[in-house]
């Protein structure tokens, strides 16, 4: 009995659902009563899901797996794994027994995009040429371990005096902290690039240091020039700093975070104390750092509706303010591909290929191409619908006339994360059925 699975690993984003494809060729007269299907972890042989005695025996794997019962009779033994975790990574064996038996193993590669790096300087004020400064680049909640690269404003790699550490949290996701020590010139730009080797996703940030003394009197309020990019459901830090004068005390401080456009109050500190969140109880200051001039705001469990500009207003004797933009993003799931019609296909037939990718933000860019990489632009219709959370489901439909055989690829790009999710379907032979039965 021939059991077929994809050669390439299935790449799944943490928190999304993954389909581990597996198919077999049922003989004429085959009935599900004859089928014995077992999914198990290849290394430990731990049972994951099974079908026996004519019925689905259910998930033995944290209740997060499901078969496709309506497709089993046609030989589709694929397994749906929900809410993928880092711990799910590895090899899964699909074992099929009817009269004969066969098995094949499919690899699941788990991935999570790294957040846009945040950059911090130490020391961060009164910098002069010749000073040694420590630049820390931090990127959060990615998987697998990242590759980190530093370069100067001219693109020249900086490899000396770099220390990078990666720590996994309880979910197995990595927080990356890379430290570069440099001696300041008259001014300089330092860029940090955090690469996810599986997703081929690059997240980068840079800091430009112009050593100088702040003019006295004014409250210089500094925020990042680039938007802060935050993944839906994660926490974001909106960085804001000011330069406290000698003798400054928190009793003098009036700090207000508000939405730039509507002036709606988000969070405040006055009368020497944190007045708390006025924004759905999802914001917090860094109280231990305020006296040093760190007025940053932590925004928890980011939602699409949070996207926009936030103003950090600081008043001591004088006042100053600056606005920081929050750009919300959510990675798109690996596209699922469907064919209509999906059986008895012959060259010359017109077929509709639908590529669907879910729960991303902002709206995606969708590209189709053939097996040679030639873009397919004609007869493509793409629709994007936002759900209640503001996340988009993308459905792109390509109508093609079949040749003798052909591969059709769909690429769904998240323009903010620069994350590409792709799916493809290969249609060969004549006549044929999709999914392939053998």
């Amino acid at each position: 009995l021939e059991v077929q699975v994809p050669e390439d690993p299935v790449v799944a984003l943490v928190g999304t659902d993954a389909t581990l494809c597996c198919s077999f060729s049922p003989e004429p007269g085959f009935s599900l009563a004859q089928l014995n299907l077992i999914w198990q972890l290849t290394d430990t042989k731990q049972l994951v899901h099974s079908f026996a005695e004519g019925q689905d025996q259910g998930s033995a794997y944290a209740n997060r797996t499901a078969l496709f019962p309506d497709l089993l009779a046609q030989g589709n033994a694929s397994l749906r794994l929900q809410r993928v975790r880092v711990a799910d990574e590895g090899s899964f064996t699909c074992f099929v027994s009817i009269r004969d038996f066969g098995s094949a193993a499919v690899s699941l590669q788990v991935a999570a995009p790294y957040s846009k790096p945040s950059m911090t300087l130490e020391p961060n004020k009164d910098l002069r040429p010749g000073d040694t400064v420590t630049i820390t680049c931090s990127s959060y909640q990615g998987y697998p371990e990242a590759e980190v690269f530093w370069q100067d404003g001219q693109g020249v790699p900086l490899t000396g005096n770099v220390t990078t550490s990666q720590m996994a949290n309880e979910q197995g996701l990595f927080d990356v902290h890379s430290i570069l020590r440099v001696v300041l010139g008259a001014n300089g730009t330092y860029s940090c690039l955090v690469r996810n080797p599986v997703l081929q996703q690059d997240a980068h940030s840079s800091v430009t240091i112009t050593p100088q003394r702040s003019p006295t009197g004014a409250v210089e309020v500094q925020v990042p020039e680039d938007p802060v990019v935050a993944l839906v459901g994660t926490d974001a830090t909106l960085r804001c700093s000011f330069s406290p004068e000698p003798g400054f005390s928190l009793a003098q401080l009036n700090l207000i975070w508000q939405l730039t456009d509507t002036k709606q109050l988000v969070h405040s500190f006055t009368e020497g104390r944190d007045q708390g969140s006025a924004y759905a109880n999802r914001t917090a200051l860094f109280p231990d750092l305020l006296a040093q001039g760190n007025a940053s705001l932590r925004l928890q469990r980011v939602r699409v509706a949070d996207e926009g500009s936030f103003t950090c207003f600081v008043s001591i004797r004088d006042f100053g303010s600056a606005a920081v933009s929050l750009q919300v993003a959510a990675p798109y799931s690996k596209p699922s591909m469907t064919l209509e019609p999906n059986k008895d296909l012959r060259p010359g037939d017109t077929v509709t290929i639908t590529c669907s990718s879910y729960r991303g933000y902002p709206e995606a860019e969708v590209f189709w191409q053939d097996g040679q990489g030639v873009p397919l632009t004609g007869n493509v219709t793409t629709s994007q619908m936002a759900n209640e959370q503001g996340l988009f489901d993308v459905h792109s439909v390509l109508r093609v006339v079949l040749g003798a055989n052909g591969t059709y690829s769909c690429l769904v790009r998240n323009p903010v994360l620069q994350q590409d999710a792709h799916g493809s379907v290969t249609i060969t032979g004549q006549p044929m059925t999709f999914p392939p039965e053998a």
């Epitope: 009036n254 405040s268 001591i316 004797r317 004088d318």
Partner: antibody, heavy 119, light 108 residues
Framework: EVQLVESGGGLVQPGGSLRLSCAAS????????MSWVRQAPGKGLELVAT????????YYADSVKGRFTISRDNAKNTLYLQMSSLRAEDTAVYYC????????????WGQGTLVTVSS | DIQMTQSPSSLSASVGDRVTITCRAS??????LAWYQQKPGKAPKLLVY???NLADGVPSRFSGSGSGTDYTLTISSLQPEDFATYYC??????????FGQGTKLEIK
């Protein structure tokens, strides 16, 4: 002694422009934020524009946004209000004021300069 | 922007009376409030800052109180020179820091 002296007011036609100046003395001008407050005849007070000590941050009342510009020259100890696209409702006495330390109000005011917008 | 509502808009009283003027903010302004006195043809004069603190040279018959959204200016015993228009102004949040519409205090 802190002194604020406004100048530049006068009669201007609707749609016209005018620049008010405020000469400051008796304090370190470059260390304080400054504001312009106006009062239409028989009406209340309205804070029109404010600027911080180095001129890097400015704010405006919605009624003048896009038409008025507040600026300062710390070397000359002078505050300015450039007014353009003037309307009849901009007719008012314009006061120059010093922003005090956090929460301390506007303790110092100039004597005011009258701007009349009329055809 | 935060709205400041003063009441009453006008008030008649006699010398020696105790007078109270109130100011209500459209949201919590955390005691970031000042009171001014203005006489005809003159610039306003600061009386009270940070809701309760008397400005330099202001007689002790003036006092300020309140917190959150509700604030009060009290003159314990009216003197002839106190007949004027009074304004409140908040200093909370980003400018423009708005004024109340004013209370005209007249001789009865």
């Amino acid at each position: 002694e802190v002194q604020l002296v406004e100048s530049g007011g006068g009669l201007v036609q609707p749609g016209g422009s005018l620049r008010l100046s405020c000469a400051a003395s008796g304090f370190t001008f470059s260390s304080y934020g400054m504001s312009w407050v106006r009062q239409a005849p028989g009406k209340g007070l309205e804070l029109v524009a404010t600027i911080n000590s180095n001129g890097g941050t400015t704010y405006y009342a919605d009624s003048v946004k896009g038409r008025f510009t507040i600026s300062r020259d710390n070397a000359k100890n002078t505050l300015y209000l450039q007014m353009s696209s003037l309307r009849a409702e901009d007719t008012a006495v314009y006061y120059c004021t010093r922003n005090e330390e956090f929460r301390r109000g506007l303790a110092y005011w100039g004597q005011g300069t009258l701007v009349t917008v009329s055809s | 922007d935060i709205q400041m509502t003063q009441s009453p808009s006008s008030l008649s009283a006699s010398v020696g009376d105790r007078v109270t003027i109130t100011c209500r903010a459209s949201e919590n302004i955390y005691s970031n409030l000042a009171w001014y006195q203005q006489k005809p043809g003159k610039a306003p004069k600061l009386l009270v800052y940070a809701a309760t603190n008397l400005a330099d040279g202001v007689p002790s018959r003036f006092s300020g109180s309140g917190s959150g959204t509700d604030y009060t200016l009290t003159i314990s015993s009216l003197q002839p020179e106190d007949f004027a228009t009074y304004y409140c102004q908040h200093f909370w949040g980003t400018p423009p820091w708005t004024f109340g519409q004013g209370t005209k205090l007249e001789i009865k």
